[in-house]
Interface confidence: low
């Protein structure tokens, strides 16, 4: 999993997130809960939850096996929730298994969490 994390991190330059906290004492970004692993069956629906909070409100991106997750109409979607973001995959196929990672940023910091769908 370390490979996955390090490659995905290339998408998110960190240099601008090392600015002194004095610049904005009110900003924060927290991973509230590690992402859940999911075991499910073919044809079923799976949901992965990215639970983060922050100020400014974080932007959340999803990756599968290091590639940006691309939404598929009526089958694979992600949306903002009050706790962060939810990724939903309907009509599961064997090709859907893999490492899923959410990366959240508030423009100054970044947090990420990885879950496995198998």
């Amino acid at each position: 999993q370390e490979t996955e994390l390090s490659v995905s991190a290339e998408l998110v330059p960190t240099s601008s997130w090392n600015i002194s906290s004095e610049l904005n004492k009110d900003s924060y970004l927290t991973l509230d809960e590690p992402m859940n692993n999911i075991t499910t069956s073919l044809g079923q629906t799976a949901e992965l939850h990215c639970k983060v909070s922050g100020n400014p409100p974080p932007t959340i991106r999803w990756f599968k096996n290091d590639a940006p997750v691309v939404q598929e109409p009526r089958r694979l979607s992600f949306r903002s929730t009050i706790y962060g973001s939810r990724l939903r995959i309907r009509n599961l196929d064997t090709t859907d298994t893999g490492y899923f990672q959410c990366v959240a940023t508030n423009g100054k910091e970044v947090v990420s969490s990885t879950g496995v769908l198998f």
């Epitope: 490979t3 490659v7 932007t59 991106r61 096996n65 290091d66 940006p68 691309v70 939404q71």
Partner: antibody
Amino acid sequence: QVQLVQSGSELKKPGASVKVSCKASGYTLTTNYMHWVRQAPGQGLEWMGWIYPGNGNTKFNHKFDGRFVFSLDTSVSTAYLQISSLKAEDTAVYYCARSDFDYWGQGTLVTVSS
Amino acid sequence: DIQMTQSPSSLSASVGDRVTITCQASQDIGNNLIWFQQKPGKAPKSLIYFATSLANGVPSRFSGSGSGTDFTLTISSLQPEDFATYYCLQYREYPLTFGPGTKVDIK
């Protein structure tokens, strides 16, 4: 460092086939998608699809179904694009690119002419 | 398919100029947009991910903005090495689609 090195230019006749290779180094091939992108002479970029070396799964742009095949030889960290029944309009530079489009091959020019 | 349009299709500018290129998606793509630079005979190079995040090693004179359907790439002070063609790419839905490109040449 990460590198994608593609095979050299090809000149083919209409109806023939061609196989373009993309050799990856400096990272783990099997945990990264490999995209293929086409650029016709003087034209823009077109996403053809990807192959996931972890399990061989592929995803195609519907414009490239049928005559186009993505394949792999993970033992030599190489991805391949094969085009059959070549047409003049297949003349283009073909690029491979890693998962996040952060690293690209240098491109392979395929010319189809009688 | 999601259609991507860019404007202008070409522009002439001088070193030191501020240059703005826009990309419009035919439907909401959130922030799922990458900007690329391509020079003649070379592979594209990524500049901006997620519409606004600077890729590794890219000079800070490049910046991206926008979300939803309207996006902008700005070069704050054009340098000689910036004369090239710029493309946007959406990765919200399959098939991934590129904009037609904007060529930036010397005035």
